[in-house]
Amino acid sequence: ILGGREAEAHARPYMASVQVNGEHLCGGVLVAEQWVLSAAHCLEDAADGKVQVLLGAHSLSQPEPSKRLYDVLRAVPHPDSRPDTIDHDLLLLQLSEKATLGPAVRPLPWQRVDRDVEPGTLCDVAGWGIVSHAGRRPDRLQHVLLPVLDRATCNRRTHHDGAITQRMMCAESNRRDSCKGDSGGPLVCGGVLEGVVTSGSRVCGNRKKPGIYTRVASYAAWIDSVLA
Protein backbone atom coordinates (compact mmCIF):
# COMPACT_ATOMS: atom_id res chain seq x y z
CA ILE A 1 0.00 0.00 0.00
CA LEU A 2 1.50 3.30 -1.07
CA GLY A 3 0.57 6.55 0.66
CA GLY A 4 -1.43 4.82 3.36
CA ARG A 5 -0.91 4.14 7.02
CA GLU A 6 -0.94 1.31 9.50
CA ALA A 7 -4.41 -0.15 9.85
CA GLU A 8 -6.21 -0.38 13.15
CA ALA A 9 -5.11 -3.73 14.56
CA HIS A 10 -7.60 -6.56 13.92
CA ALA A 11 -10.29 -4.11 12.76
CA ARG A 12 -10.46 -5.89 9.39
CA PRO A 13 -11.30 -9.42 10.56
CA TYR A 14 -11.86 -10.53 6.96
CA MET A 15 -8.26 -9.82 5.95
CA ALA A 16 -6.11 -12.77 4.89
CA SER A 17 -2.48 -13.23 3.96
CA VAL A 18 -1.98 -15.85 1.27
CA GLN A 19 1.39 -17.38 1.97
CA VAL A 20 3.82 -19.68 0.17
CA ASN A 21 6.39 -21.55 2.24
CA GLY A 22 5.63 -19.24 5.17
CA GLU A 23 6.13 -15.99 3.25
CA HIS A 24 3.43 -13.45 2.42
CA LEU A 25 2.63 -13.57 -1.28
CA CYS A 26 -0.79 -11.97 -1.75
CA GLY A 27 -3.74 -10.56 0.09
CA GLY A 28 -7.04 -12.33 0.40
CA VAL A 29 -10.45 -11.87 1.92
CA LEU A 30 -12.48 -14.31 3.99
CA VAL A 31 -15.87 -14.56 2.26
CA ALA A 32 -17.20 -17.67 4.03
CA GLU A 33 -16.14 -19.75 7.02
CA GLN A 34 -14.02 -22.02 4.86
CA TRP A 35 -13.30 -19.87 1.83
CA VAL A 36 -10.88 -17.07 1.01
CA LEU A 37 -11.14 -15.03 -2.18
CA SER A 38 -7.90 -13.84 -3.79
CA ALA A 39 -6.40 -13.25 -7.25
CA ALA A 40 -5.76 -16.08 -9.72
CA HIS A 41 -2.34 -14.78 -10.70
CA CYS A 42 -1.15 -15.29 -7.15
CA LEU A 43 -1.01 -19.03 -7.79
CA GLU A 44 1.40 -18.53 -10.70
CA ASP A 45 3.93 -17.07 -8.28
CA ALA A 46 3.42 -19.94 -5.89
CA ALA A 47 5.15 -22.45 -8.19
CA ASP A 48 5.19 -25.76 -6.33
CA GLY A 49 5.40 -24.21 -2.89
CA LYS A 50 3.06 -24.94 0.00
CA VAL A 51 0.14 -22.51 -0.09
CA GLN A 52 -1.38 -21.54 3.25
CA VAL A 53 -3.68 -18.81 4.49
CA LEU A 54 -3.04 -16.67 7.56
CA LEU A 55 -6.12 -15.29 9.31
CA GLY A 56 -6.51 -13.05 12.36
CA ALA A 57 -3.20 -11.29 11.79
CA HIS A 58 -2.06 -7.71 12.10
CA SER A 59 1.66 -8.32 12.32
CA LEU A 60 3.07 -11.01 10.04
CA SER A 61 5.98 -11.75 12.37
CA GLN A 62 4.77 -11.20 15.92
CA PRO A 63 2.77 -13.72 17.91
CA GLU A 64 -0.90 -12.70 18.23
CA PRO A 65 -3.62 -14.68 20.01
CA SER A 66 -6.00 -14.46 17.06
CA LYS A 67 -3.49 -15.54 14.41
CA ARG A 68 -3.85 -18.91 12.77
CA LEU A 69 -2.32 -20.46 9.67
CA TYR A 70 -4.61 -22.72 7.64
CA ASP A 71 -3.63 -25.27 5.03
CA VAL A 72 -5.43 -25.09 1.70
CA LEU A 73 -7.63 -28.04 0.79
CA ARG A 74 -8.48 -26.83 -2.69
CA ALA A 75 -7.48 -23.91 -4.92
CA VAL A 76 -10.07 -22.90 -7.51
CA PRO A 77 -8.94 -20.25 -9.99
CA HIS A 78 -11.63 -18.77 -12.22
CA PRO A 79 -11.84 -21.11 -15.24
CA ASP A 80 -11.29 -18.25 -17.69
CA SER A 81 -8.29 -16.70 -15.96
CA ARG A 82 -5.11 -16.68 -18.08
CA PRO A 83 -1.47 -15.92 -17.31
CA ASP A 84 -1.24 -13.23 -19.99
CA THR A 85 -4.30 -11.16 -19.00
CA ILE A 86 -5.87 -9.66 -15.89
CA ASP A 87 -9.36 -10.74 -17.01
CA HIS A 88 -11.23 -12.95 -14.50
CA ASP A 89 -8.38 -12.60 -12.00
CA LEU A 90 -10.10 -14.41 -9.14
CA LEU A 91 -9.15 -17.38 -7.01
CA LEU A 92 -11.08 -19.18 -4.31
CA LEU A 93 -9.12 -21.04 -1.66
CA GLN A 94 -10.87 -23.66 0.43
CA LEU A 95 -9.32 -23.91 3.88
CA SER A 96 -8.54 -27.33 5.33
CA GLU A 97 -11.20 -26.66 7.95
CA LYS A 98 -13.71 -23.98 8.86
CA ALA A 99 -12.02 -20.92 10.30
CA THR A 100 -12.47 -20.29 14.00
CA LEU A 101 -14.50 -17.10 13.97
CA GLY A 102 -14.19 -14.33 16.53
CA PRO A 103 -13.68 -10.56 16.78
CA ALA A 104 -10.50 -10.79 14.68
CA VAL A 105 -11.69 -13.41 12.18
CA ARG A 106 -14.97 -12.91 10.35
CA PRO A 107 -16.18 -13.14 6.74
CA LEU A 108 -16.94 -9.94 4.85
CA PRO A 109 -20.25 -9.51 3.01
CA TRP A 110 -19.63 -9.20 -0.72
CA GLN A 111 -21.56 -7.24 -3.31
CA ARG A 112 -24.10 -9.26 -5.24
CA VAL A 113 -25.86 -6.43 -7.07
CA ASP A 114 -24.08 -6.05 -10.40
CA ARG A 115 -23.98 -2.26 -10.52
CA ASP A 116 -20.97 0.04 -10.79
CA VAL A 117 -19.84 1.87 -7.66
CA GLU A 118 -20.37 5.61 -8.12
CA PRO A 119 -17.18 7.44 -9.13
CA GLY A 120 -15.69 9.38 -6.22
CA THR A 121 -16.89 6.86 -3.65
CA LEU A 122 -14.14 6.40 -1.07
CA CYS A 123 -13.19 2.75 -0.68
CA ASP A 124 -10.78 1.06 1.69
CA VAL A 125 -8.00 -1.18 0.45
CA ALA A 126 -5.65 -2.97 2.82
CA GLY A 127 -2.68 -5.26 2.55
CA TRP A 128 0.87 -6.23 3.44
CA GLY A 129 2.18 -5.19 0.03
CA ILE A 130 5.15 -2.88 -0.48
CA VAL A 131 4.93 0.61 1.02
CA SER A 132 7.62 2.32 -1.04
CA HIS A 133 8.93 2.30 -4.59
CA ALA A 134 12.11 0.87 -3.13
CA GLY A 135 10.10 -2.24 -2.30
CA ARG A 136 10.00 -1.97 1.49
CA ARG A 137 7.61 -4.56 2.91
CA PRO A 138 5.63 -3.78 6.06
CA ASP A 139 5.26 -6.20 8.91
CA ARG A 140 1.92 -4.77 10.00
CA LEU A 141 -1.22 -4.39 7.91
CA GLN A 142 -1.52 -1.11 6.00
CA HIS A 143 -4.57 0.56 4.50
CA VAL A 144 -5.58 3.50 2.35
CA LEU A 145 -8.83 5.14 1.27
CA LEU A 146 -9.09 5.49 -2.49
CA PRO A 147 -11.72 7.20 -4.66
CA VAL A 148 -13.35 5.07 -7.34
CA LEU A 149 -12.49 6.29 -10.83
CA ASP A 150 -15.01 6.15 -13.65
CA ARG A 151 -14.33 3.49 -16.29
CA ALA A 152 -14.26 5.95 -19.18
CA THR A 153 -11.37 7.89 -17.63
CA CYS A 154 -9.61 4.67 -16.68
CA ASN A 155 -9.88 3.47 -20.27
CA ARG A 156 -8.34 6.59 -21.80
CA ARG A 157 -5.44 6.00 -24.15
CA THR A 158 -3.17 7.75 -21.64
CA HIS A 159 -4.37 5.46 -18.86
CA HIS A 160 -5.30 1.81 -19.47
CA ASP A 161 -6.22 2.27 -23.12
CA GLY A 162 -9.45 0.28 -23.25
CA ALA A 163 -8.28 -2.68 -21.16
CA ILE A 164 -10.82 -2.15 -18.39
CA THR A 165 -13.88 -4.32 -18.97
CA GLN A 166 -17.32 -4.09 -17.36
CA ARG A 167 -16.13 -6.76 -14.94
CA MET A 168 -13.38 -4.52 -13.57
CA MET A 169 -13.31 -1.22 -11.70
CA CYS A 170 -10.63 1.38 -11.15
CA ALA A 171 -9.49 3.53 -8.27
CA GLU A 172 -7.32 6.63 -8.19
CA SER A 173 -3.60 5.98 -7.94
CA ASN A 174 -2.18 9.46 -7.38
CA ARG A 175 0.52 8.66 -4.80
CA ARG A 176 -1.98 6.56 -2.82
CA ASP A 177 -2.39 3.10 -4.31
CA SER A 178 -2.36 -0.65 -3.88
CA CYS A 179 0.88 -2.27 -5.01
CA LYS A 180 2.95 -5.44 -5.28
CA GLY A 181 1.93 -7.85 -2.54
CA ASP A 182 -1.54 -6.33 -2.17
CA SER A 183 -2.92 -8.39 -5.06
CA GLY A 184 -5.89 -10.52 -4.07
CA GLY A 185 -6.78 -8.14 -1.25
CA PRO A 186 -10.16 -6.48 -0.72
CA LEU A 187 -11.48 -3.15 -1.96
CA VAL A 188 -14.24 -2.34 0.52
CA CYS A 189 -16.84 0.34 -0.19
CA GLY A 190 -19.43 1.20 2.41
CA GLY A 191 -18.51 -1.90 4.39
CA VAL A 192 -19.05 -4.30 1.48
CA LEU A 193 -16.49 -6.14 -0.64
CA GLU A 194 -16.73 -4.57 -4.10
CA GLY A 195 -13.40 -5.43 -5.65
CA VAL A 196 -10.31 -7.62 -5.48
CA VAL A 197 -6.89 -6.16 -6.25
CA THR A 198 -5.72 -7.56 -9.58
CA SER A 199 -2.24 -9.00 -9.78
CA GLY A 200 0.05 -7.74 -12.46
CA SER A 201 3.18 -5.69 -13.00
CA ARG A 202 1.33 -2.36 -13.07
CA VAL A 203 3.32 0.65 -11.95
CA CYS A 204 2.05 1.88 -8.56
CA GLY A 205 1.29 5.39 -7.39
CA ASN A 206 1.17 6.90 -10.87
CA ARG A 207 -2.07 8.80 -11.48
CA LYS A 208 -2.01 7.82 -15.16
CA LYS A 209 -2.09 4.13 -14.24
CA PRO A 210 -5.08 3.71 -11.92
CA GLY A 211 -5.44 0.67 -9.71
CA ILE A 212 -7.45 -2.13 -11.30
CA TYR A 213 -9.85 -4.24 -9.26
CA THR A 214 -11.97 -7.24 -10.23
CA ARG A 215 -15.64 -6.52 -9.51
CA VAL A 216 -16.93 -9.36 -7.33
CA ALA A 217 -20.60 -8.69 -8.17
CA SER A 218 -19.82 -9.59 -11.77
CA TYR A 219 -18.75 -13.05 -10.60
CA ALA A 220 -21.53 -13.77 -8.11
CA ALA A 221 -22.75 -16.85 -9.98
CA TRP A 222 -19.27 -18.36 -10.12
CA ILE A 223 -18.53 -17.61 -6.46
CA ASP A 224 -21.84 -19.10 -5.38
CA SER A 225 -21.29 -22.22 -7.50
CA VAL A 226 -17.86 -22.87 -5.96
CA LEU A 227 -18.98 -22.19 -2.41
CA ALA A 228 -22.10 -24.36 -2.78
Partner: antibody, heavy 121, light 106 residues
Framework: EVQLQQSGPELVKPGASVKISCKAS????????MHWVKQSHGNILDWIGY????????SKNQKFTGKATVTADKSSSTAYMELRSLTSEDSAVYYC??????????????WGTGTTVTVSS | QIVLSQSPAILSASPGEKVTMTCRAS?????MHWYQQKPGSSPKPWIY???NLASGVPARFSGSGSGTSYSLTISRVEAEDAATYYC?????????FGGGTKLEIK
Protein backbone atom coordinates in the same frame (compact mmCIF):
# COMPACT_ATOMS: atom_id res chain seq x y z
CA GLU B 1 -5.89 16.38 19.40
CA VAL B 2 -7.27 16.92 15.92
CA GLN B 3 -8.81 20.37 15.50
CA LEU B 4 -10.39 22.11 12.53
CA GLN B 5 -10.58 25.87 12.96
CA GLN B 6 -12.72 27.69 10.42
CA SER B 7 -12.71 31.31 9.31
CA GLY B 8 -15.22 33.80 10.68
CA PRO B 9 -18.70 34.73 9.49
CA GLU B 10 -19.17 36.30 6.06
CA LEU B 11 -21.78 38.79 4.89
CA VAL B 12 -21.75 38.93 1.09
CA LYS B 13 -23.84 40.47 -1.64
CA PRO B 14 -25.83 38.40 -4.15
CA GLY B 15 -23.76 37.46 -7.19
CA ALA B 16 -20.48 37.77 -5.31
CA SER B 17 -18.04 35.01 -4.30
CA VAL B 18 -16.63 34.03 -0.93
CA LYS B 19 -13.71 31.82 0.10
CA ILE B 20 -13.83 30.19 3.50
CA SER B 21 -10.97 28.38 5.21
CA CYS B 22 -10.42 25.44 7.53
CA LYS B 23 -7.08 25.25 9.33
CA ALA B 24 -6.16 21.80 10.57
CA SER B 25 -3.93 21.01 13.53
CA UNK B 26 -2.97 18.00 15.62
CA UNK B 27 -2.37 15.58 12.73
CA UNK B 28 -0.69 15.14 9.37
CA UNK B 29 -2.78 17.36 7.09
CA UNK B 30 -1.84 15.50 3.93
CA UNK B 31 -2.78 12.11 5.36
CA UNK B 32 -6.55 12.49 5.39
CA UNK B 33 -9.40 13.64 3.17
CA MET B 34 -11.08 16.93 4.01
CA HIS B 35 -14.83 17.10 3.46
CA TRP B 36 -17.21 20.06 3.34
CA VAL B 37 -20.82 20.00 4.51
CA LYS B 38 -23.54 22.65 4.17
CA GLN B 39 -26.20 23.20 6.82
CA SER B 40 -28.98 25.40 5.57
CA HIS B 41 -31.49 27.18 7.77
CA GLY B 42 -33.92 24.29 7.82
CA ASN B 43 -31.02 22.43 9.45
CA ILE B 44 -30.67 20.24 6.37
CA LEU B 45 -27.16 18.75 6.06
CA ASP B 46 -25.74 18.46 2.55
CA TRP B 47 -22.40 16.87 1.72
CA ILE B 48 -20.60 19.16 -0.74
CA GLY B 49 -17.43 17.26 -1.54
CA TYR B 50 -13.93 16.30 -0.43
CA UNK B 51 -10.31 16.88 -1.33
CA UNK B 52 -7.20 14.82 -0.72
CA UNK B 53 -4.73 17.50 0.40
CA UNK B 54 -1.79 15.32 -0.58
CA UNK B 55 -2.54 15.11 -4.30
CA UNK B 56 -5.45 17.46 -4.96
CA UNK B 57 -7.80 14.64 -5.98
CA UNK B 58 -11.34 15.76 -5.21
CA SER B 59 -14.94 14.72 -5.67
CA LYS B 60 -18.07 16.80 -5.49
CA ASN B 61 -21.79 16.36 -5.07
CA GLN B 62 -23.20 17.19 -8.52
CA LYS B 63 -25.67 19.45 -6.77
CA PHE B 64 -22.77 21.84 -6.11
CA THR B 65 -21.23 21.77 -9.59
CA GLY B 66 -20.49 25.35 -10.61
CA LYS B 67 -21.14 26.53 -7.07
CA ALA B 68 -18.33 25.19 -4.89
CA THR B 69 -14.61 24.65 -5.47
CA VAL B 70 -12.48 22.92 -2.85
CA THR B 71 -8.71 23.37 -2.61
CA ALA B 72 -5.97 22.76 -0.08
CA ASP B 73 -2.67 24.39 0.81
CA LYS B 74 -0.21 21.89 2.26
CA SER B 75 2.22 24.55 3.47
CA SER B 76 -0.34 26.07 5.83
CA SER B 77 -2.37 22.90 6.54
CA THR B 78 -5.45 24.75 5.39
CA ALA B 79 -8.36 23.66 3.22
CA TYR B 80 -10.47 26.18 1.35
CA MET B 81 -13.87 26.25 -0.24
CA GLU B 82 -14.88 28.96 -2.66
CA LEU B 83 -18.57 29.60 -3.30
CA ARG B 84 -19.50 31.70 -6.30
CA SER B 85 -22.54 33.43 -7.85
CA LEU B 86 -24.07 33.57 -4.40
CA THR B 87 -27.82 33.74 -3.85
CA SER B 88 -29.98 33.65 -0.73
CA GLU B 89 -30.11 29.86 -1.13
CA ASP B 90 -26.41 29.77 -0.28
CA SER B 91 -26.95 31.40 3.12
CA ALA B 92 -25.96 28.63 5.50
CA VAL B 93 -23.39 27.33 7.95
CA TYR B 94 -20.55 25.52 6.19
CA TYR B 95 -18.50 22.88 7.99
CA CYS B 96 -15.26 21.16 7.17
CA UNK B 97 -15.07 17.62 8.55
CA UNK B 98 -12.93 14.52 8.34
CA UNK B 99 -12.26 10.98 9.46
CA UNK B 100 -9.00 10.52 11.33
CA UNK B 101 -9.17 6.85 12.24
CA UNK B 102 -7.80 3.80 10.46
CA UNK B 103 -10.64 1.31 10.41
CA UNK B 104 -12.54 -0.07 7.40
CA UNK B 105 -15.45 2.29 7.89
CA UNK B 106 -15.17 6.04 7.78
CA UNK B 107 -17.38 8.75 9.17
CA UNK B 108 -17.02 12.39 10.14
CA UNK B 109 -15.40 11.97 13.53
CA UNK B 110 -14.10 15.56 13.68
CA TRP B 111 -16.03 18.63 12.57
CA GLY B 112 -14.86 22.19 12.13
CA THR B 113 -16.24 25.12 14.10
CA GLY B 114 -18.48 26.15 11.20
CA THR B 115 -18.56 29.31 9.09
CA THR B 116 -21.80 31.24 8.71
CA VAL B 117 -22.30 32.73 5.27
CA THR B 118 -25.10 35.27 4.88
CA VAL B 119 -26.05 36.46 1.42
CA SER B 120 -27.87 39.75 1.53
CA SER B 121 -27.99 42.99 -0.42
CA GLN C 1 -28.39 9.32 -5.01
CA ILE C 2 -29.51 7.54 -1.84
CA VAL C 3 -32.24 9.48 -0.04
CA LEU C 4 -32.51 9.07 3.73
CA SER C 5 -35.86 9.74 5.42
CA GLN C 6 -35.97 10.15 9.18
CA SER C 7 -39.04 9.77 11.35
CA PRO C 8 -40.51 11.23 13.34
CA ALA C 9 -39.34 14.76 12.55
CA ILE C 10 -39.99 15.74 16.16
CA LEU C 11 -40.02 13.38 19.11
CA SER C 12 -41.20 14.43 22.54
CA ALA C 13 -40.34 12.27 25.53
CA SER C 14 -40.25 12.40 29.31
CA PRO C 15 -37.09 11.58 31.28
CA GLY C 16 -36.76 7.83 31.81
CA GLU C 17 -38.79 6.95 28.71
CA LYS C 18 -37.50 4.68 25.98
CA VAL C 19 -37.45 6.29 22.54
CA THR C 20 -36.66 5.04 19.06
CA MET C 21 -36.10 7.07 15.91
CA THR C 22 -35.79 5.56 12.45
CA CYS C 23 -33.92 6.24 9.25
CA ARG C 24 -35.07 4.70 5.96
CA ALA C 25 -32.89 4.60 2.86
CA SER C 26 -34.23 4.74 -0.70
CA UNK C 27 -31.93 1.84 -1.57
CA UNK C 28 -30.07 -0.69 0.52
CA UNK C 29 -26.99 0.35 2.45
CA UNK C 30 -24.80 -1.86 4.58
CA UNK C 31 -24.18 0.46 7.51
CA MET C 32 -25.44 3.75 8.87
CA HIS C 33 -23.83 6.51 10.93
CA TRP C 34 -25.61 8.84 13.37
CA TYR C 35 -24.68 12.32 14.57
CA GLN C 36 -26.00 14.45 17.42
CA GLN C 37 -26.27 18.22 17.10
CA LYS C 38 -27.26 20.77 19.70
CA PRO C 39 -28.20 24.36 18.81
CA GLY C 40 -25.18 26.56 18.08
CA SER C 41 -22.78 23.61 17.96
CA SER C 42 -21.21 21.48 15.25
CA PRO C 43 -22.58 17.95 14.78
CA LYS C 44 -20.89 15.25 16.86
CA PRO C 45 -20.33 11.64 15.84
CA TRP C 46 -22.73 9.55 17.91
CA ILE C 47 -23.07 6.07 16.47
CA TYR C 48 -20.87 4.71 13.66
CA UNK C 49 -21.20 1.66 11.44
CA UNK C 50 -24.80 1.06 12.60
CA UNK C 51 -24.20 0.01 16.19
CA ASN C 52 -20.88 1.30 17.55
CA LEU C 53 -21.01 4.13 20.05
CA ALA C 54 -18.60 7.00 19.48
CA SER C 55 -16.25 7.98 22.28
CA GLY C 56 -18.07 9.45 25.28
CA VAL C 57 -21.56 8.42 24.18
CA PRO C 58 -23.59 6.99 27.09
CA ALA C 59 -24.46 3.30 27.02
CA ARG C 60 -28.19 4.09 27.04
CA PHE C 61 -27.83 4.78 23.32
CA SER C 62 -27.88 1.95 20.82
CA GLY C 63 -28.14 1.57 17.07
CA SER C 64 -29.41 -1.24 14.88
CA GLY C 65 -30.74 -2.04 11.45
CA SER C 66 -29.85 -3.36 8.03
CA GLY C 67 -30.74 -2.90 4.38
CA THR C 68 -33.04 0.08 4.10
CA SER C 69 -34.15 0.43 7.73
CA TYR C 70 -32.04 1.67 10.64
CA SER C 71 -32.82 2.96 14.09
CA LEU C 72 -31.34 4.78 17.06
CA THR C 73 -32.74 3.91 20.48
CA ILE C 74 -32.32 5.57 23.87
CA SER C 75 -33.26 3.15 26.63
CA ARG C 76 -33.94 5.84 29.26
CA VAL C 77 -34.00 9.40 28.01
CA GLU C 78 -32.24 12.09 30.02
CA ALA C 79 -32.53 15.88 29.74
CA GLU C 80 -29.06 16.16 28.19
CA ASP C 81 -30.22 14.03 25.23
CA ALA C 82 -32.31 16.91 23.88
CA ALA C 83 -30.82 17.49 20.42
CA THR C 84 -31.31 16.77 16.73
CA TYR C 85 -30.06 13.39 15.48
CA TYR C 86 -29.03 12.84 11.88
CA CYS C 87 -28.36 9.59 10.06
CA UNK C 88 -25.78 9.45 7.26
CA UNK C 89 -24.88 6.85 4.64
CA UNK C 90 -21.35 6.34 3.31
CA UNK C 91 -22.04 3.52 0.88
CA UNK C 92 -22.20 5.69 -2.20
CA UNK C 93 -21.18 9.08 -3.51
CA UNK C 94 -22.82 11.54 -2.91
CA UNK C 95 -22.84 10.86 0.82
CA UNK C 96 -26.23 11.85 2.16
CA PHE C 97 -27.80 12.78 5.48
CA GLY C 98 -31.31 12.31 6.76
CA GLY C 99 -33.47 15.34 7.54
CA GLY C 100 -33.01 14.84 11.26
CA THR C 101 -35.14 13.92 14.27
CA LYS C 102 -35.44 16.60 16.91
CA LEU C 103 -35.73 15.11 20.39
CA GLU C 104 -37.50 17.31 22.90
CA ILE C 105 -37.65 16.52 26.59
CA LYS C 106 -40.95 17.24 28.36
Amino acid sequence: EVQLQQSGPELVKPGASVKISCKASGYSFTGYYMHWVKQSHGNILDWIGYIDPDNGVSSKNQKFTGKATVTADKSSSTAYMELRSLTSEDSAVYYCAGYYGSSWYWYFDVWGTGTTVTVSS
Amino acid sequence: QIVLSQSPAILSASPGEKVTMTCRASSSVSYMHWYQQKPGSSPKPWIYATSNLASGVPARFSGSGSGTSYSLTISRVEAEDAATYYCQQWSSNPYTFGGGTKLEIK
